[in-house]
């Protein structure tokens, strides 16, 4: 029998400076593509090597991005969210939610729609 898998959720403000190749990460999500069950939020799907986000080190794959420069990302179409990032300027402030898996008891199973890891 599997043990219970709990999650520690924390929020953080991350300030990035756009580098020569941009911010250096990919996103998924939006009201038109629910990558997480019952959640149309925007998630980090890929951190690119040597990009601004990777060099900063705080943003992680699986993080949920709550806002960009103070603008809420709730209820946005995917492409609208992409455009928001692309037009965010040189200095970009991200409010992010980290979701860390905490294992209790025997190893649990994480579904494919879980952004952690």
């Amino acid at each position: 029998m599997n043990g219970r898998v709990d999650y520690l959720v924390t929020e953080e403000e991350i300030n990035l400076t756009r580098g020569p190749s941009g911010l250096g990460f990919n996103i998924v999500g939006g009201t038109d593509q629910q990558y997480v069950s019952n959640d149309s939020g925007i998630y980090v799907s890929r951190i690119k090597e040597n990009g601004a986000a990777a060099l900063d080190g705080r943003l992680q794959e699986g993080d949920k991005i709550l806002s960009v420069n103070g603008q809420d990302l709730k209820n946005l179409l995917h492409q609208d969210a992409v455009d928001l990032f692309r037009n965010a300027g040189y200095a970009v402030s991200l409010r992010v939610q980290h979701r860390l898996q905490v294992q209790n008891g025997p190893i649990g199973h994480r579904g494919e729609g879980d952004p952690s890891g």
Epitope: S21, G22, N26, V44, R46, E61, G113
Partner: nanobody, 132 residues
Framework: EVQLVESGGGLVQAGGSLRLSCAAS????????MGWFRQAPGKERELVST????????????????HYADSVKGRFTISRDDAKNTVYLQMDSLKPEDTALYYC??????????????????WGQGTQVTVS
């Protein structure tokens, strides 16, 4: 980390068929597109076909959009088995000019930066297809 392993390549006569497979393992969250590329000796790598991955309520679903290079339209068919996290390329009516090393690639979401079309995040090692 994500691993992509191709199989199914080989030597076939012109007019014959092959079915390539690409199995993805590791982290699949956020995978949005899988594609096949090829590179013939002395030529640039070129896109062969892509399939988008539909996510609904935290699960992948079949029926993603497909795209084909003009040179393979009507001869090649891309498909995906969601349960196996595997993408296939059925290649029929093969021609000598289809001879190349075939690579599988996966893209995870949309870049928040402007990107080039073949900016995929993970690549397989390739499988050789030779048409005589």
């Amino acid at each position: 980390e994500v691993q992509l392993v191709e199989s199914g390549g080989g030597l076939v006569q012109a007019g014959g068929s092959l079915r390539l497979s690409c199995a993805a393992s590791g982290r699949t969250f956020g995978m949005s597109t899988m594609g096949w590329f090829r590179q013939a000796p002395g030529k640039e790598r070129e896109l062969v076909s892509t399939i988008s991955i539909i996510w609904r309520d935290g699960r992948t679903q079949s029926g993603g959009r497909t795209h084909y290079a003009d040179s393979v339209k009507g001869r090649f068919t891309i498909s995906r088995d969601d349960a196996k996290n595997t993408v296939y390329l059925q290649m029929d009516s093969l021609k000598p000019e289809d001879t190349a090393l075939y690579y599988c690639a996966a893209r995870f979401g949309s870049s928040v930066d402007v990107i080039i079309p073949d900016d995929y995040d993970y690549w397989g090692q390739g499988t050789q297809v030779t048409v005589s």
